[in-house]
């Protein structure tokens, strides 16, 4: 009922409460003296539904039939007009329109942990739009019934608050649940299980790890379960995997021992638990435990390259380099390399640890035979030395290989094809591919990459530290016992015009031609490896074409002579450089004017 | 300290209604589930219904359908309504408090700390 009602009532038949599709009769009625003051004749009663007229009556009552209520609550106002007033409310009333509650289905109950407490849950069916009531029943052993009620709008869930415990676990208990609303109710079909079957185990805690004489060939996982846990399952990752090793347990009494676990390497561990075989549900996975596995000795030998460098007639310079061990391989930090260098035929040898570099640069006697022995150490121990015999790499022209070229494949990749040498193919142990940024000067701080072929491939695909814009120095080396062949070619994986183009810093006269001296492009300005130089002149105010003289670009050279111009003609002269992509912009301008004689 | 009194018994007819009532003092009421016995003569205490502290009811399968155990916090108050009585309901009913947690310990008499004096019932045919 609406407000107090005072001058009239409406009344609801069947129901306040209806199925969705039923049809109600509203009766709006005056209590006696309450229509308009004059003459109740000209009373008009209204019926609203919401703030819609639906119906109106001359009298004392009305009678409205109703149909196609939606689901939900519908406000009904009976109002009452009388000529020159303002329409005054008589009564309403709400009809609830809804539908019986659905068979609630899946009804399942679930413990955690053996002192956790019985709780289910069901899906509902569609909503009933009306306040339903679900009672939620557990009957178990010694005749005893628990029952719980929901107080709730949307109630898919009951905790009993109470705990099963596993004095006979194989007893059995029915669950049920039921939901009772004004227009029927309806029960879940009944839910039996066991205490197995519904405890689930709160998952294992106090998770550690032991390696037994710091070995991870002995490691042992610890942990805390619950007391009627039987099966445990362990899955443990390198902690930079996706990918999990599963293990299965069976009356593992909190312990585990692995025998599958990579040294030096980052593990995370979880387990699982469960009561029974084939009853009940595994636990949670517990929280991740983190643990580093202890160092073995390294495995594998170290790559190593090397450089020499002619310094003066009794001397030479050694420059070694070395890849580090991949993590699998090195089991552990790599505290230091140990190089041992030696004169094979006198028999001395000289030892040193390297920390912290990749490469080492000696000074030798350039008589004798010399080899490198090069390990890596961790806290456990070294690598197996690799050996290396130092020789004139590229002494044996017959070895070189030949038709070396340098192509562009892709973003920041270069390509590298060659044919075998002309001497024995076969003959070819591995080919080698080294590359450095090509820097005029040779500076040997420069860093060195190579990579080892096999004597079957006549190609290699180079990617490491390769920049765009930048020349690489790419030697290729066949290997044979104790010889080497190489052959060398200028390479880069992007290029475009130089920046800019060489500076003329001199030019001097000699004997009736002139010397252009230049100093390099910057490396940064290069734009990738240049081809040519040229050389332009023309005579000083003239508007005829410069004429040009084109110069193979070579690393080390920086002047060249022009004896085509005339004496005693004021030249100018500038310079560009090439790439294969085109033409710098010009260098300085130089005025030079020649001297000598005319021929 | 919880003490515990009934009231409410007496003598009915056969298929009649009772309601028992036990007050409570104390202000821990609501810390406690409450239960109610009853011993007939001749026979040991009886475990007959329960309401947990989270309100979940308990009835023993005999009495289930015909007797509703309730509880009033704010008036710690706990009452057993008893429809469709029968002669061998008559017995002496106790109220009881306790903190039973399992499945099991709620009908051992061993869970209740505190008990009422009792009240009698007696259903003639």
């Known amino acids: 009922k609406i407000d107090a009602c005072k001058r009239g009532d409406v009344t609801v038949k069947p129901s306040h409460v209806i199925l969705l599709g039923s049809t109600v009769n509203i009766t709006c009625s005056l209590k006696p003296r309450q229509g308009c003051f004059h003459y109740s004749r000209r009373n008009k009663l209204i019926l609203y539904k919401f703030d819609r007229r639906i119906n109106f009556h001359h009298g004392h009552s009305l009678n409205s039939q109703v149909t196609g209520l939606p689901l939900g609550t519908t406000l009904f106002v009976c109002k009452l007009a009388c000529i020159n007033s303002d329409e005054i409310q008589i009564c309403g009333a709400e009809i609830f329109v809804g539908v019986a509650p659905e068979q609630p289905q899946n009804l399942s109950c679930i413990q955690k942990g053996e002192q956790g407490t019985v709780a289910c849950t069901w899906e509902r069916g569609r909503d009933t739009h009306l306040y339903t009531e679900y009672t939620l029943q557990l009957s178990g052993p010694k005749n005893l019934t628990w029952q719980k009620q929901c107080k709730d709008i949307y109630c898919d869930y009951l905790d009993f608050g109470i705990n099963l415990t596993p004095e006979s676990p194989e007893s059995n208990f029915t669950a049920k649940v039921t939901a009772v609303n004004s227009l029927g109710s309806s029960s879940s079909l009944p839910s039996t299980f066991t205490f197995l079957d519904i405890v689930r185990p709160l998952p294992p805690w106090d998770i550690r790890i032991k390696f037994q004489k710091a070995s991870v060939s002995r490691c042992t996982l610890y942990w805390r379960d619950e007391g009627l846990v039987l099966l445990n399952r362990l899955r443990y990752r390198p902690s930079n995997s996706r990918l999990w090793n599963m293990v299965n347990v069976t009356k593992a009494k909190g312990r585990h021992d692995l025998l599958d676990l990579k040294p030096f390497t980052e593990y995370e561990f979880q387990i699982s638990s469960k009561l029974h075989l084939y009853k009940g549900s595994w636990s949670d996975w517990s929280e991740s435990l983190r643990a580093q596995t202890p160092e073995e000795e390294p495995t594998g030998m170290l790559d190593v390259w090397y450089m020499k460098r002619h310094i003066d007639y009794s001397r030479q310079q050694i420059s070694l380099f070395w890849k580090n061990l991949s993590v699998s391989e090195a089991r552990g930090k790599i505290l230091h390399y140990q190089v041992t260098l030696q004169e094979l035929t006198g028999g001395k040898a000289m030892t040193q640890n390297i920390t912290g570099h990749t490469s080492w640069t000696t000074v030798i006697p350039r008589t004798g035979n010399w080899a490198v022995a090069v390990s890596a150490a961790n806290s456990k121990g070294s690598s197996l030395p690799t050996r290396i015999n130092i020789m004139n790499l590229c002494e044996a022209g017959l070895l070189a290989p030949r038709q070396v070229s340098a192509n562009s494949e892709g973003m920041d990749n270069i390509l590298v094809t060659w044919q075998p040498p002309r001497k024995d193919p076969s003959a070819v142990q591995e080919y080698v591919v080294e590359w450095r940024e090509l820097h005029p000067g040779g500076d040997t701080q420069v860093p060195l990459n190579w990579l080892r072929s096999r004597p079957y491939n006549v190609s290699a695909l180079i990617s490491e530290n390769i920049k765009s814009y930048i020349c690489y120095e790419i030697r290729v080396y066949a290997l044979s016992g104790d010889q080497g062949g190489c052959s060398s070619i200028l390479g880069n994986s992007k290029h475009k015009a130089p920046l800019s183009g060489p500076h003329i810093n001199a030019i001097t006269e000699e004997k009736g031609s002139i010397l252009i001296s230049w100093n390099s492009i910057p490396v940064q300005e290069q734009m990738g490896c240049l081809l040519h130089y040229r050389i332009y002149w023309k005579e000083r105010d003239s508007n005829s074409q410069p004429q040009l003289c084109e110069i193979p670009y070579r690393v080390s050279q920086n002047s060249h002579p022009i004896n085509s111009l005339q004496p005693r003609v004021t030249y100018v002269l500038w310079m560009t450089a090439l790439t294969a992509a085109g033409e710098s912009s010009h260098g300085n301008e130089r005025e030079f004017c020649l001297q000598g004689k005319a021929n | 300290q919880v003490q515990l009194q009934e009231s409410g018994g007496g003598l009915v007819q056969a298929g009649g209604s009772l309601r028992l009532s036990c007050a409570a003092s104390?202000?821990?009421?609501?810390?406690?589930?409450m239960a109610w016995f009853r011993q007939a003569p001749g026979k040991e205490r009886e475990f007959i219904a329960a309401i947990t502290r989270s309100d979940t009811t308990l009835y023993i399968d005999s009495v289930k359908g015909r007797f509703t155990i309730s509880r009033d916090n704010a008036k710690n108050t706990v009452a057993l309504q008893m429809n469709s009585l029968k002669p061998e309901d008559t017995a002496v009913y106790y109220c009881?408090?306790?903190?039973?947690?399992?499945?099991?310990?709620?009908?051992?008499?061993?869970?209740?700390?505190?008990w009422g004096r009792g009240t009698q019932v007696t259903v003639s045919s």
């Open positions: 104390g202000r821990t009421f609501n810390n406690y589930a």
């Open positions: 009881a408090a306790g903190m039973p947690y399992s499945y099991s310990d709620y009908p051992r008499d061993s869970k209740y700390d505190y």
